[in-house]
C-alpha cells in the first residue's frame, strides 16, 4: 500500500435544499484505470461510510441506486454531490481515494470538508 495526497476544500455550506458539492482531487502517481472513491463522515469521533463508488477512468461514477451521492470524474478530480442533507448531518466529510488497478495499490485520505447544513424554514401554511 502506497500513500497518495488527496485535497478537498476545508469548509462548504450546503444549499438551502440540503445539497453540498465539493471536488476531491488526488495526486495520481501513475496511470490508474480503476479508482474507488469513498466518502466518510466524521462526527463526535465516530466515522461512518456515506457512500462509495468504483469507476474506470473516463467513465462516470456509479453509486448505488439508493445512494445520497452522485459524482463525475475528470482526470484526477472527482466532483462529489451529497443530497438530502439535514442540519443533523453537519459534520466532517472525508474523501478517501484508492487506485485499485493496475498495481501498485495507492491509498489517499483527505483532511475532510466540514459541511454545514441548515434546515430550511418551514413554509407558512397558505390557503388556496
Amino acid at each position: 500500500c502506497k500513500a497518495m495526497h488527496v485535497a478537498q476544500p476545508a469548509v462548504v455550506l450546503a444549499s438551502s435544499r440540503g445539497i453540498a458539492s465539493f471536488v476531491c482531487e488526488y495526486a495520481s502517481p501513475g496511470k490508474a484505470t480503476e479508482v474507488r472513491v469513498t466518502v466518510l463522515r466524521q462526527a463526535d469521533s465516530q466515522v461512518t461510510e456515506v457512500c462509495a463508488a468504483t469507476y474506470m477512468m473516463g467513465n462516470e461514477l456509479t453509486f448505488l441506486d439508493d445512494s445520497i451521492c452522485t459524482g463525475t470524474s475528470s482526470g484526477n478530480q472527482v466532483n462529489l454531490t451529497i443530497q438530502g442533507l439535514r442540519a443533523m448531518d453537519t459534520g466532517l466529510y472525508i474523501c478517501k481515494v484508492e487506485l485499485m488497478y493496475p498495481p501498485p495499490y495507492y491509498l489517499g485520505i483527505g483532511n475532510g470538508t466540514q459541511i454545514y447544513v441548515i434546515d430550511p424554514e418551514p413554509c407558512p401554511d397558505s390557503d388556496f
Epitope: P9, A10, V11, V12, L13, A14, S15, S16, S21, F22, A43, D44, A87, T90, L92, Q114, Y116, V117, I118
Partner: antibody
Framework: QVQLVQSGAEVKKPGASVKVSCKAS????????IGWVRQAPGQGLEWMGW????????NYAQKLQGRVTMTTDTSTSTAYMELRSLRSDDTAVYYC??????????WGQGTTVTVSS | EIVMTQSPATLSLSPGERATLSCRAS???????LSWYQQKPGQAPRLLIY???TRATGIPARFSGSGSGTDFTLTISSLQPEDFAVYYC?????????FGPGTKVDIK
C-alpha cells in the same frame, strides 16, 4: 502568512447602506468561508453570518435577515458585507474572519462603521 | 439557535493566580465545535482554543480547555500581565454560530 485586510472606517447617515471589504491572502480563498462579526461600543461579539467562498452559499443571523448581503469575488480573494437601512444601533466595529470548521482562526483588523445624523 | 452563557461576567485576580472561566450551551454541542477567543481593548479577537481543548498555533501552554456536552471550561494556570482581557466562547456546531457574552479578567 494568512491575512485578512479590511477596508477603512465609514461614517453613514441613518437609512444609508455600507459595504465593507475583506481581502484575503496567504491561503486558498475558496477552501474556506468568511464570517462577519460585529461589536458595538463596549459590547460583546455578535455573529452576523458567513459565506462559503467555495460555492457562495450564505447563512445570516435571523435579526439581520433582509438587511445584510455577503458576497465574494474569488478572482481577487475578497469578501464583502453590505448592510442596508442603517440605524444608530448598527454603529460598531465590523470584523471579517476565516471560517474553517472548528473555530474562526484568522481575523481582519476591523472596520469602524458609525451611523449618525 | 444555541444560546451561550458565560460566568462569571468579571473575574478579578492577581498575576500568578489561576483563572477558571465557564461557558454553558443551551443545548449539547459536540466538543469539536467549541472555541475560545481572547480580546484585548482596541484589538481583534484571537483564537485560543478550538475543539474544546486544542490550543491554536502560538498559544502558550498555560491556556487549557476542557468540557463536553453543555459545559466547557477555559483555564489559565498562572495569569501573566498580558492575559488580562475579555474571553469569549463560541459554538459552530449549529447555524447560526453564536458567541457567549464574554468574561472580563481584570487585575485585582
Amino acid at each position: 502568512q494568512v491575512q485578512l485586510v479590511q477596508s477603512g472606517a465609514e461614517v453613514k447617515k441613518p437609512g444609508a447602506s455600507v459595504k465593507v471589504s475583506c481581502k484575503a491572502s496567504g491561503y486558498t480563498f475558496t477552501s474556506y468561508g468568511i464570517g462577519w462579526v460585529r461589536q458595538a461600543p463596549g459590547q460583546g461579539l455578535e455573529w452576523m453570518g458567513w459565506i462559503s467562498a467555495y460555492n457562495g452559499n450564505t447563512n445570516y443571523a435571523q435579526k439581520l435577515q433582509g438587511r445584510v448581503t455577503m458576497t465574494t469575488d474569488t478572482s481577487t480573494s475578497t469578501a464583502y458585507m453590505e448592510l442596508r437601512s442603517l440605524r444608530s444601533d448598527d454603529t460598531a466595529v465590523y470584523y471579517c474572519a476565516r471560517v474553517r470548521g472548528g473555530g474562526v482562526d484568522v481575523w481582519g483588523q476591523g472596520t469602524t462603521v458609525t451611523v449618525s445624523s | 439557535e444555541i444560546v451561550m452563557t458565560q460566568s462569571p461576567a468579571t473575574l478579578s485576580l492577581s498575576p500568578g493566580e489561576r483563572a477558571t472561566l465557564s461557558c454553558r450551551a443551551s443545548q449539547s454541542v459536540s466538543s469539536s465545535y467549541l472555541s475560545w477567543y481572547q480580546q484585548k481593548p482596541g484589538q481583534a479577537p484571537r483564537l485560543l482554543i478550538y475543539g474544546a481543548s486544542t490550543r491554536a498555533t502560538g498559544i502558550p501552554a498555560r491556556f487549557s480547555g476542557s468540557g463536553s456536552g453543555t459545559d466547557f471550561t477555559l483555564t489559565i494556570s498562572s495569569l501573566q500581565p498580558e492575559d488580562f482581557a475579555v474571553y469569549y466562547c463560541q459554538q459552530d456546531y449549529n447555524l447560526p454560530f453564536t458567541f457567549g457574552p464574554g468574561t472580563k479578567v481584570d487585575i485585582k
